[in-house]
């Protein structure tokens, strides 16, 4: 029995006609099974295969090879969270966090907790002590005075 065009199988009860549109992107094998075009997958070959490495959790695509990030995620593979806007010396594990690096504090990690180490403000051999975020105190050697032992 020879089947009509696009019909396959015993009894010619399987239909497959190649298509490349909203409904699917496929060719047909000799048995009438849909064979997805490169970059497509799923039962109807209408699901795009995203860029290799694209985060399955935070990235997606509607076109093969693409990787579109969910809100709050960024990077080529959508695997990097976006920190809180204005976060200076901080990182995130989840979107909009601002987890401060060592020696930084405050909501935006913009307060220096180690002003002495970062700026070394005390002159003329003065000893620096961190007294709070962005705050310090110099203990001046004999003969020197002023906030930074500059006098």
């Amino acid at each position: 029995v020879t089947c009509d065009d696009y019909y396959y199988g015993f009894g010619c009860n399987k239909f497959c006609r190649p298509r490349d549109d909203f409904f699917g992107h496929y060719a047909c094998d000799q048995n009438g099974n849909k064979t997805c075009m490169e970059g497509w997958m799923g039962p109807e070959c209408n699901r795009a295969i995203c860029r290799q490495g694209c985060s399955p959790k935070h990235g997606s695509c509607k076109l093969p090879g693409d990787c579109r990030c969910q809100y709050g995620w960024q990077g080529l593979y959508c695997d990097k969270c976006i920190p809180h806007p204005g976060c200076v010396h901080g990182i995130c594990n989840e979107p909009w966090q601002c987890l401060c690096e060592t020696n930084w504090g405050g909501q935006l990690c913009d307060k220096d907790l180690n002003y002495c180490g970062t700026h070394q403000p005390c002159l003329n051999g003065g000893t620096c002590s961190n007294t709070g975020p962005d705050k310090y105190q110099c203990s001046c050697p004999e003969g020197y005075s002023g906030p930074n032992c500059e006098i």
């Epitope: 696009y6 239909f15 409904f23 209408n46």
Partner: antibody
Framework: QVQLVQSGAEVKKPGASVKVSCKAS????????IHWVRQAPGQGLEWMGI????????KYAQKFQGRVTMTVDTSTSTAYMELSSLRSEDTAVYYC?????????WGQGTLVTVSS | DIQMTQSPSSLSASVGDRVTITCRTS??????LTWYQQKPGKAPKLLVY???ILAAGVPSRFSGSGSGTDFTLTISSLQPEDFATYYC?????????FGGGTKLEIK
């Protein structure tokens, strides 16, 4: 087994909106598109549109463009059809249906009555 | 949009009769055609898809044929439960329009 269960009958005033739900079970929801079809009393079947349940992309019949919105909630395997600016001619049974090569599965239908 | 012309719009026949319903499309739709049966107050039931493939559980007295623009649904020997309304629908491109329906009544 595959089932599509729709929300109950609605009575709406002209100008209002209606949102009909269609809860799917018995298969992987995102593997198949959902279509919406309506049937006015004593009339034939009218195709309204299709939604790709994986991406949420939808395509509508020109007649309903601008008035219909089809959405899905994949977490509950539910499709929704919202029709706005209702008029008396929108009184119909609204069906959801599943498929690519024709509709093997249909919801039981939701009667929407538009009356002042 | 593809127009679907279904004929006849109504038909009277007797049990045991052979019945043919036709559907013509305004452009080539290959074999992207479906036939449904609908009874009052019920959702349509899929009978034939891709023009000639019988849906699961549908009796073999139903058959579909045609491709391109001309399609036929045939019931070889009418049974009492076959009296209903029949619709064709294309699924070639958007929108998936339906034919106007054929009401099959008992003579």
């Amino acid at each position: 087994q595959v089932q599509l269960v729709q929300s109950g009958a609605e009575v709406k005033k002209p100008g209002a909106s209606v949102k009909v739900s269609c809860k799917a079970s018995g298969y992987t929801f995102t593997d198949y598109a959902i279509h919406w079809v309506r049937q006015a009393p004593g009339q034939g079947l009218e195709w309204m549109g299709i939604i790709n349940t994986y991406y949420g992309d939808s395509k509508y019949a020109q007649k309903f463009q601008g008035r219909v919105t089809m959405t899905v909630d994949t977490s509950t395997s539910t499709a929704y059809m919202e029709l706005s600016s209702l008029r008396s001619e929108d009184t119909a049974v609204y069906y959801c249906a599943r498929g690519y090569d024709g509709f093997a599965y249909w919801g039981q239908g939701t009667l929407v009555t538009v009356s002042s | 949009d593809i127009q679907m012309t279904q004929s006849p719009s109504s038909l009277s026949a007797s049990v045991g009769d052979r019945v043919t319903i036709t559907c013509r499309t305004s452009e080539n739709i290959y074999s992207y055609l479906t036939w449904y049966q609908q009874k009052p107050g019920k959702a349509p039931k899929l009978l034939v898809y891709n023009a000639k493939i019988l849906a699961a559980g549908v009796p073999s007295r139903f058959s579909g044929s045609g491709s391109g623009t001309d399609f036929t649904l045939t019931i070889s020997s009418l049974q009492p439960e076959d009296f209903a309304t029949y619709y064709c629908q294309h699924h070639y491109d958007i929108p998936w329009t339906f034919g106007g329906g054929t009401k099959l009544e008992i003579k």
